[in-house]
């Protein structure tokens, strides 16, 4: 999607975690027919591997060709490998599909590092562990790519779930979810529960384990605890939201809230880290360093380059602070906060040297394109992309990794004034002069 290496994210083992499970609150919204409840056939339909993306099984063409597709709320193209590539076990073979239609148009998507290009067409698409429907959707058949596919990731394409405004080559190319809603009775919302394992998974464990759930067209109560809190989607391009305050262990970073959203804040399942604007990143790291000062870590750790390891089972979670992001609420002058633990922002990785240790990378990094709430945030929560009501909901995920002392949280309301002014207004530029 937008920039840099948007390494997708990590998955994990399903089910409720050991330890604390929050009681369900009773003051939830009234039921909306067809939108809430149980979606058994879609629960546990995601898999993945640490830092490499959550993917869902999809079928394309007639007869159906099965592919694993990365779920990405930070882009808007449905694009699949359509030619041999060393990292692909399989790819979309258009010539074998009787329902393929060529749009006779190319598409080129460059990133800061890497790119993909392909040919546009349409075909019949369905999601085996999704709604029981088939839709004709736009497909970018990737014929050439560089640093896009990931060796061993087990996915062969990408499902961009954001809005048409950021679709390539332009906003006239209808995204998959728009086609799905237009052609079927599926309600215009989806929800994601991404489950971090809390420890590294090898290839066979990934294939056997559950990485989470993508509920298409609804909300499944079994996937979260407590209440859902909603923040408005500021503008329908990325899933853009407004952050009004940031705290480290309850201490306000005390920055002008515009800085938190410079030049935007988005919810992006296709990014591993919590990415923060330069000034915010520097202030946050300074505060996290101070809070965890009982142990010293090399500079490379805070830059996300170096691992830090502890003897198996001895990770000192308690020395690391919780991080709270306050989001604009749906009600005027009201915000709510989402709080993540070090279990979310320290990403488990396999140490090449020894498997006796538990090793982690710092999964908060610097951004020049605004705040990106990637897997580090999403793995703590059940996230509802309520496109119909132009809002995003957060509740504590039933599968988030925590310990017996602390849990991720979604809490509110907090009286907060003039929140609209926390949003940054990106200057309108002639699109022809923009570089991706």
């Amino acid at each position: 999607t937008q920039h840099g290496i948007r390494l997708p994210l990590r998955s994990g083992l399903g089910g409720a975690p050991l330890g604390l499970r929050l009681p369900r609150e009773t003051d939830e919204e009234p039921e909306e027919p067809g939108r809430r409840g149980s979606f058994v056939e879609m629960v546990d339909n995601l898999r993945g591997k640490s830092g490499q993306g959550y993917y869902v099984e999809m079928t394309v063409g007639s007869p159906p060709q099965t592919l694993n597709i990365l779920v990405d709320t930070g882009s808007s193209n449905f694009a699949v490998g359509a030619a041999p590539h060393p990292f692909l076990h399989r790819y979309y073979q258009r010539q074998l599909s009787s329902t393929y239609r060529d749009l006779r148009k190319g598409v080129y998507v460059p990133y800061t590092q890497g790119k993909w290009e392909g040919e546009l067409g349409t075909d019949l698409v369905s999601i085996p562990h999704g709604p029981n429907v088939t839709v004709r959707a736009n497909i970018a058949a990737i014929t050439e790519s560089d640093k896009f596919f990931i060796n061993g990731s087990n996915w062969e394409g990408i499902l961009g779930l954001a809005y048409a405004e950021i679709a390539r080559p332009d906003d006239s190319l209808e995204p998959f979810f728009d086609s799905l809603v237009k052609q079927t009775h599926v309600p215009n919302l989806f929800s994601l529960q991404l489950c971090g394992a809390g420890f590294p998974l090898n290839q066979s464990e990934v294939l056997a384990s559950v990485g989470g759930s993508m509920i298409i067209g609804g909300i499944d109560h079994s996937l979260y605890t407590g209440s859902l809190w909603y923040t408005p989607i500021r503008r329908e391009w990325y899933y853009e939201v407004i952050i009004v305050r940031v705290e480290i262990n309850g201490q306000d970073l005390k920055m002008d809230c515009k800085e938190y959203n410079y030049d935007k804040s988005i919810v992006d399942s296709g990014t591993t880290n919590l990415r923060l604007p330069k000034k915010v990143f520097e202030a946050a790291v300074k505060s996290i360093k101070a809070a965890s000062s009982t142990e010293k870590f090399p500079d490379g750790f805070w830059l996300g380059e170096q691992l830090v390891c502890w003897q198996a089972g001895t990770t000192p979670w308690n020395i690391f602070p919780v991080i709270s992001l306050y989001l604009m609420g749906e009600v005027t002058n009201q915000s709510f906060r989402i709080t993540i633990l070090p279990q979310q922002y320290l990403r488990p990785v396999e140490d090449v040297a020894t498997s006796q240790d538990d090793c982690y990378k710092f999964a908060i990094s610097q951004s020049s394109t605004g705040t990106v709430m990637g897997a580090v945030i999403m793995e703590g929560f059940y996230v509802v992309f309520d496109r119909a009501r132009k809002r995003i909901g957060f509740a504590v995920s039933a599968c988030h990794v925590h310990d017996e002392f602390r849990t991720a949280a979604v809490e509110g309301p907090f009286v907060t004034l003039d929140m609209e002014d926390c949003g940054y207004n990106i200057p309108q530029t002639d699109e022809s002069t923009l570089m991706t």
Epitope: K254, D256, C257, F414, T416, L417, D418, E420
Partner: nanobody, 126 residues
Framework: QVQLQESGGGSVQAGGSLRLSCAAS????????MAWFRQAPGKERGGVAT????????YYADSVKGRFTISQDRAKNTVYLQMNSLKPEDTGIYYC???????????????????WGQGTQVTVSS
């Protein structure tokens, strides 16, 4: 630099009333939030009531809703806190505070305020 001076504190029986005043050295116009905070013995300073002077909009801590009223007299550069049905737990030092208007403002959070008065003691006995 805004200077703030509180007055009106004192001792009162539970159920009684007091009216606190906060005089500002220069008028805290539409660009300011004005607030009252209290600090009970051995506790942190907590928000009681806030006034967004531009709109005469008010915000109250749950514990004082329906009992306390914050208001202003622009002509006198003064903000008031009318306290009715006082309880022993309302005892503490009451501070007046001011802050320039800014986005993403948490009106009952003391860390958001730049200017403070010296405080006035309120004691409520049972």
């Amino acid at each position: 630099q805004v200077q703030l001076q509180e007055s009106g504190g004192g001792s009162v029986q539970a159920g009684g009333s007091l009216r606190l005043s906060c005089a500002a050295s220069e008028y805290t116009d539409s660009t300011y939030y004005m607030a009252w905070f209290r600090q009970a013995p051995g506790k942190e300073r907590g928000g009681v009531a806030t006034l967004a002077s531009r709109y005469d909009t008010t915000y109250y801590a749950d514990s004082v809703k329906g009992r306390f009223t914050i208001s202003q007299d622009r002509a006198k550069n003064t903000v008031y806190l009318q306290m009715n049905s006082l309880k022993p737990e309302d005892t503490g030092i009451y501070y007046c505070a001011a802050s320039p208007r800014r986005p993403g403002f948490f009106p009952l959070d003391p860390s958001q305020y730049n200017y403070w008065g010296q405080g006035t003691q309120v004691t409520v006995s049972s």
